[in-house]
């Protein structure tokens, strides 16, 4: 049989409608005009195309828009978004939050974290900054997605927007991202009273420097162990036993449970054993009494 690449007359497509779900992949390829598909994208998601058929439709759009789809097409991708790779999405320019919402909804329940992260990145680039409306959309439709942004992108968040970020939105943020967000949060919440300030700043403390952690220890905040464990190792190591005791308040007993985990383990190694003993928790591994500590890094800096 000669391979058929032309569309049989009875299968010719004049509009995108339900009848197309009965077309085989090959028939869709031969019979659907890419320009017609692009013009009637608003109809596509209402038609329950199979995953395999979506491959063909994507191929059509890729041929029509090799430099990336226009937003008029992206807005109506619907389940076709499931077929997009991060490389495809990097070619897009997206400014509309309605487009973002529509695609975030489709991605739910599918393993698409890389695609979603790239999409959010394109929205931030398209809108020029991570504004309040974008943050509100992310927190409503994609909790945790804020942390998919690079520190560079997060640096475009104005401090005024930080108040819209909820603790659960920061759960998956890494240290580099919190390093960027913490100073903005500090600025955003600076006029709040002690206890109110601590509640607000707590999710961002993974980016706090030692000075700020020391300052908190003077404010009777009773930091919970989970927050303490998320502090930067470098911020915890210079703290004295007295400062940690003041910082944690009644939660200090939790140090025993976390004795083997960083940053507690590293902090214990830096403390005098007799100072640790004052806590009465049985923490072991501190510097034995009578030992002299030479900080060679200081001597090197002076020479």
């Amino acid at each position: 049989d000669v391979e058929r690449t032309t569309c049989p007359p009875e299968k010719e497509v004049h509009e995108i409608d339900e009848s197309l779900i009965f077309y085989k992949k090959r028939e869709l390829e031969a019979c659907v005009d890419a320009a017609l598909l692009a013009a009637q994208m608003d109809r596509v998601d209402a038609i329950p195309f199979t995953y395999e058929q979506l491959d063909v439709l994507k191929h059509k759009l890729d041929e029509l828009y090799p430099q990336g789809y226009p937003e008029s097409v992206i807005r109506h991708l619907g389940h076709l978004f499931l077929k997009m790779s991060p490389e495809d999405i990097r070619k897009w320019n997206v400014t509309s939050l309605e487009t973002l919402k529509a695609l975030l909804k489709v991605s739910k329940g599918h393993e698409m974290s890389a695609q979603v992260a790239t999409l959010i990145d394109r929205v931030v680039v398209g809108r020029g900054q991570l504004d309040k409306d974008t943050v509100d959309t992310l927190t409503a439709f994609c909790p945790g997605c804020l942390c998919s942004l690079s520190p560079e992108r997060l640096s475009s968040v104005p401090p005024s927007v930080i108040g819209a970020v909820r603790p659960q939105d920061l759960d998956t943020c890494g240290p580099r991202q919190l390093d960027v967000l913490y100073p903005k949060a500090r600025l955003a919440f600076q006029n709040m009273s002690g206890s109110e300030y601590f509640v607000k700043i707590r999710p961002f403390l993974g980016g706090a420097p030692t000075e700020d952690v020391k300052a908190l220890s003077q404010q009777n905040v009773s930091m919970d162990l989970a927050t303490f464990m998320k502090l930067r190792r470098e911020a915890v190591l210079p703290l004295t036993v007295a400062e940690v005791q003041k910082l944690l308040g009644p939660h200090v007993e939790g140090l025993k449970v976390e004795e083997q985990h960083s940053p507690v383990r590293d902090w214990i190694l830096k403390q005098r054993q007799d100072d640790l003993d004052t806590l009465g928790l049985g923490l072991q591994g501190g510097i034995p009494n009578g030992y002299l500590i030479l900080d060679l890094s200081v001597r090197e800096a002076l020479s």
Epitope: R4, I21, F22, R26
Partner: antibody, heavy 118, light 107 residues
Framework: EVQLQQSGAELVKPGASVKLSCTAS????????MHWVKQRTEQGLEWIGR????????KYAPKFQGKATITADTSSNTAYLQLSSLTSEDTAVYYC???????????WGQGTSVTVSS | DIVMTQSQKFMSTSVGDRVSITCKAS??????VGWYQQKPGQSPKALIY???NRHTGVPDRFTGSGSGTDFTLTISNVQSEDLADYFC?????????FGGGTKLVIK
């Protein structure tokens, strides 16, 4: 009336191969996908794979990759399923079915019983 | 692979009753679900395609519904000839997968 006529029962030895056929009447297989499905006694249905007879494009369930080969001959309007390196696990009834682009299976053959025994 | 779960292996009903057989997909399959009837010693027969559309010649007492992950085949006014196994199939993504089947038993 649409009909899918399958070849007769097979009794084959372990390690051998078998080729089953499915001939369509009242429609042209080129216009449809042709699927093969396995059913073991008192067990459910398992999709083996399908072919687009028009261009020979096939798709298999990972489980049957290497075990099953689906082919089609449009001149005789027939689809085939070849099973290789047979074991007792391959003892089952095999059905062919035709379907449109949706992937659903609209019409089924009567089934071919394959028994693998020494 | 997408797993199709038919939690009821057997369903007992009486002639004239209404019975609902359910099928749950492990992920969203939109409306790409078919229902098949297999009578003892026979090959499967298509009843419903695309979740809610009856195949030609299927009595209107058979109704399909659902989308996404939850699907139902309802047989109203059950007849003695409806004694059979009923399977759901997802054809949204390959490998296509069937539910384990529900055997309808007439009291």
């Amino acid at each position: 009336e649409v009909q899918l006529q399958q070849s007769g029962a097979e009794l084959v030895k372990p390690g051998a191969s078998v080729k089953l056929s499915c001939t369509a009447s009242a429609f042209n297989i080129k216009d449809y996908y042709m699927h093969w499905v396995k059913q073991r006694t008192e067990q459910g249905l398992e999709w083996i794979g399908r072919i687009d007879p028009e261009d020979g494009e096939t798709k298999y369930a990972p489980k049957f990759q290497g075990k099953a080969t689906i082919t089609a001959d449009t001149s005789s309007n027939t689809a085939y399923l070849q099973l290789s390196s047979l074991t007792s696990e391959d003892t089952a009834v095999y059905y062919c079915a035709s379907g449109s682009g949706t992937g659903a299976m609209d019409y089924w053959g009567q089934g071919t019983s394959v028994t693998v025994s020494s | 692979d997408i797993v199709m779960t038919q939690s009821q292996k057997f369903m007992s009903t009486s002639v004239g009753d209404r019975v609902s057989i359910t099928c749950k997909a492990s992920q969203n399959v939109r409306t790409a679900v078919g229902w098949y009837q297999q009578k003892p010693g026979q090959s499967p027969k298509a009843l419903i395609y695309l979740a809610s559309n009856r195949h030609t010649g299927v009595p209107d007492r058979f109704t399909g519904s659902g989308s996404g992950t939850d699907f139902t085949l309802t047989i109203s006014n059950v007849q003695s000839e409806d004694l059979a196994d009923y399977f759901c199939l997802q054809h949204w993504n390959s490998p296509y997968t069937f539910g384990g089947g529900t055997k309808l038993v007439i009291k």
